[in-house]
């Protein structure tokens, strides 16, 4: 659900955290128009994710943790 | 009807651990999060960290990092907290609570609907 | 100390409207639903107010919520003695990447 570099919707699939690698905010006040989370999993996919829900928002705070574990 | 029902009271020594369980009746378990919240007495509520039974994986507030630990047994709809190296201040009340909608809901993000009947944990030498 | 603080008291009389703030910024309460729970003494809190001004079920119609920015507010209408309690606001932070309880205000009915 992106087009060029914005998400214009949200993933109707949950993403479970070991296929994920890393992440990037995408913010509406930015040049998008929608707020999002894009995940980058480990098949190179970019997944466009609702940055309310709550496995997005436990998904996102495991990859901070790990990056600062690095 | 969703219920949280928590293990019994605890007395600890200051260095010690302490675990506490959370069993859930009621209601699907593992696409739920569950967080744990403490309240010092007379203190207002601290989140703790949480988890989604599914994704096996917990998260932590940082100033807990290191000694907390929560799991998930999705075998018996349970939910645990483990605190180690138990200090005086970590003497309080300790609740686990589930939120409102499923791991996919956005507008409940956070809304802890049920809760337990809350752990009384005492840390004293 | 919390990140989103709201006054330590609040009170009024029976029938009065009492209306209880909370302050956060941009990457907590700017950002996401905002959630209020009410806490008798000696209970464990109770979910009032879910996605900034949704009642969950058995919630009377005198608790109402609103957002604005990067504050929320709880109003009691007509207010009565059993809603003399502790009121906590709440939100995700994204900047902390945790959820976050604001600093609680207890209302007095007098």
């Known amino acids: 659900a992106s087009n060029f570099d914005c998400c214009l919707g949200y993933t109707d699939r949950i993403l479970h955290p070991k296929f994920i690698v890393g992440f990037t905010r995408q913010l509406a006040n930015e040049g998008c128009d929608i707020n999002a989370i894009i995940f980058h999993t480990k098949k190179k996919l970019s997944v466009c994710a609702n940055p309310k829900q709550t496995w997005v928002k436990y998904i996102v705070r495991l990859l901070s943790k790990k990056v600062k574990n690095m | 009807e969703v219920q949280l029902v928590q293990s019994g009271p605890e007395v600890k020594k200051p260095g010690s651990s302490v675990k506490v369980s959370c069993r859930a009746s009621?209601?699907?378990?593992?696409?739920?999060?569950f967080s744990w919240v403490r309240q010092a007495p007379g203190q207002g509520l601290e989140w703790m960290g949480g988890?989604?039974?599914?994704?096996?994986?917990?998260i932590y507030a940082q100033k807990l990092q290191g000694r907390l630990t929560i799991t998930a047994d999705t075998s018996t709809d349970t939910a645990y907290m483990e605190l180690s190296n138990l200090r005086s201040g970590d003497t309080a009340v300790y609740y686990c609570a589930r939120e409102w909608g499923d791991y996919y809901s956005s507008v409940s993000s956070g809304a802890l609907h049920y809760w337990g009947q809350g752990t009384l944990v005492t840390v004293s030498s | 100390q919390s990140v989103v603080t709201q006054p330590p008291s609040a009170s009024g009389t029976p029938g009065q409207r009492v209306t209880i703030s909370c302050s956060g910024s941009r990457s907590n309460i700017g950002s996401n639903i905002v959630n209020w729970y009410q806490q008798l003494v000696g209970t464990a809190p109770k979910l009032l107010i879910y996605s900034d001004n949704q009642r969950p079920s058995g919630v009377p119609d005198r608790f109402s919520g609103s957002k604005s920015g990067t504050s929320a507010s709880l109003a009691i209408s007509g207010l009565q003695s059993e809603d003399e309690a502790d009121y906590y606001c709440?939100?995700?932070?994204?900047?902390?990447?945790?959820?976050?309880f604001g600093t609680g205000t207890k209302v007095t009915v007098l």
């Open positions: 009621g209601g699907t378990f593992s696409t739920y999060a």
């Open positions: 988890i989604i039974p599914v994704f096996e994986t917990p």
């Open positions: 709440a939100a995700w932070d994204d900047s902390l990447n945790r959820y976050v």
